[in-house]
């Protein structure tokens, strides 16, 4: 499966939209920063077959969509930017799903690495717990925004490696 060039552009646009979403100075939130334990090893892409790597990327984007689709999120971020953000995430999910369908029967290995999917879910659970503990404060959302941007940048690296594997 060839991830289309539009997928890479969409990832870049997603990062740009998130960059515009900031509402308060992050420098007022230095004390709120938190180590969410990003599962770096799941995005190194070395131990994966292609289909498994795609499923991990899909889970990451799906969880991001879920995180920013809550009413607490809607109350925090600019509605126009959020709508653009959803559109880009939806585009990426569609691309990845189409890719996963093409990979069916191509590889002997399972399409999903269940442990990796669970690891990504637990990562997002930690983020949600943090937001809950911080009562969804503006600074908590600012910290989460930076974290998601960082994780998207890292997942973009995996996507690049997948493209080079074609």
């Amino acid at each position: 499966c060839d991830l289309p060039q539009t997928h890479s552009l969409s990832n870049r646009r997603t990062l740009m939209i998130m960059a515009q979403m900031g509402r308060i100075s992050p420098f007022s939130c230095l004390k709120d920063r938190h180590d969410f334990g990003f599962p770096q090893e799941e995005f190194d892409g070395n131990q994966f077959q292609k289909a498994q790597a795609i499923s991990v990327l899909h889970e990451m984007i799906q969880q991001t969509f879920n995180l920013f689709s809550t009413k607490d999120s809607s109350a925090t971020w600019d509605e126009t930017l959020l709508d653009k953000f959803y559109t880009e995430l939806y585009q990426q999910l569609n691309d990845l799903e189409a890719c996963m369908m093409q990979e069916v029967g191509v590889e002997d290995t399972p399409l999903m690495n269940v442990d990796s999917i669970l690891t990504v879910r637990k990562y997002f659970q930690r983020i949600t717990l943090y937001l809950t503990e911080k009562k969804y404060s503006p600074c908590a959302w600012e910290v989460v925004r930076a974290e998601i941007m960082r994780s998207f940048s890292l997942s973009a690296n995996l996507q690049e490696r997948l493209r080079r594997k074609e």
Epitope: M16, Q20, P26, L30, K31, R33, H34, G37, M149, R150
Partner: antibody
Framework: QVQLQESGTVLARPGASVKMSCKAS????????MHWVKQRPGQGLEWIGV????????TYNQKFKDKAKLTAVTSANTAYMELSSLTNEDSAVYFC?????????????WGQGTTVTVSS | DIVLTQSPASLAVSLGQRATISCRAS??????????MHWYQQKPGQTPKLLIY???NLESGVPARFSGSGSGTDFTLNIHPVEEEDAATYYC?????????FGSGTKLEIK
């Protein structure tokens, strides 16, 4: 590839003002914070402040808040720093540096530096 | 402001040996699992180069002979085995709170 191109050497009189530039290329200028750092001859590094070109948001080291003014022109992919009321203490090399890893606030790419010499 | 005290101010290490540079902060720069301490290398006439971020993470492209450790107020940069090209001044920098500050630098000479 990422590049930060700073303006050349500046010679200025005490009491004067100077404005230096930092032209960015090879990345999305509006989505990365840009730091400015001072280095006096044979001495260490001092953090002056930071600007977000996307919206012009700035944060300063209190020590420099009356000395430095940071601005950016997104259409030119260029950040600027203006230093006012110059004294001999302002003679230094000034670096623009790109913020790295979002809220970790490290600096990955550095301009070559603008040398400011204040002399009467 | 958080003061970063680097020691020693200078050191000379034989080729292939270990260089150890210390950076002590006047206040903790660690919160919730991250230590906001970073290390840079500056060679004469050049710009600083990021080596280590968050106390122990090796920046991409930096040789594995560089390593960082520490948390709270005490941090260390290790270079082993030292090579000729490592002759430079090394700075620590924190981003724990405003203003961000740098250490005064440690000059490494290769014997």
């Amino acid at each position: 590839q990422v590049q930060l191109q700073e303006s050349g050497t500046v010679l200025a009189r005490p009491g004067a003002s100077v404005k230096m530039s930092c032209k960015a290329s090879g990345y999305s200028f509006t989505t990365y914070w840009m730091h400015w750092v001072k280095q006096r001859p044979g001495q260490g590094l001092e953090w002056i402040g930071v600007i977000y070109p996307g919206n012009g948001d700035t944060t300063y080291n209190q020590k420099f808040k009356d000395k430095a003014k940071l601005t950016a022109v997104t259409s030119a992919n260029t950040a600027y720093m203006e230093l006012s009321s110059l004294t001999n203490e302002d003679s230094a090399v000034y670096f623009c540096t790109r913020n790295y890893k979002y809220d970790y606030y490290t600096m990955d790419y550095w301009g070559q530096g603008t040398t400011v010499t204040v002399s009467s | 402001d958080i003061v970063l005290t680097q020691s020693p101010a200078s050191l000379a290490v034989s080729l292939g040996q270990r260089a150890t540079i210390s950076c002590r902060a006047s206040k903790s720069v660690s919160t919730s699992g991250h230590s906001y301490m970073h290390w840079y290398q500056q060679k004469p006439g050049q710009t600083p180069k990021l080596l280590i971020y968050l106390a122990s993470n090796l920046e991409s492209g930096v040789p594995a002979r560089f390593s960082g450790s520490g948390s709270g107020t005490d941090f260390t940069l290790n270079i082993h085995p030292v090579e000729e090209e490592d002759a430079a001044t090394y700075y620590c920098q924190h981003s724990g709170e405003l203003p961000f500050t740098f250490g005064s630098g440690t000059k490494l000479e290769i014997k």
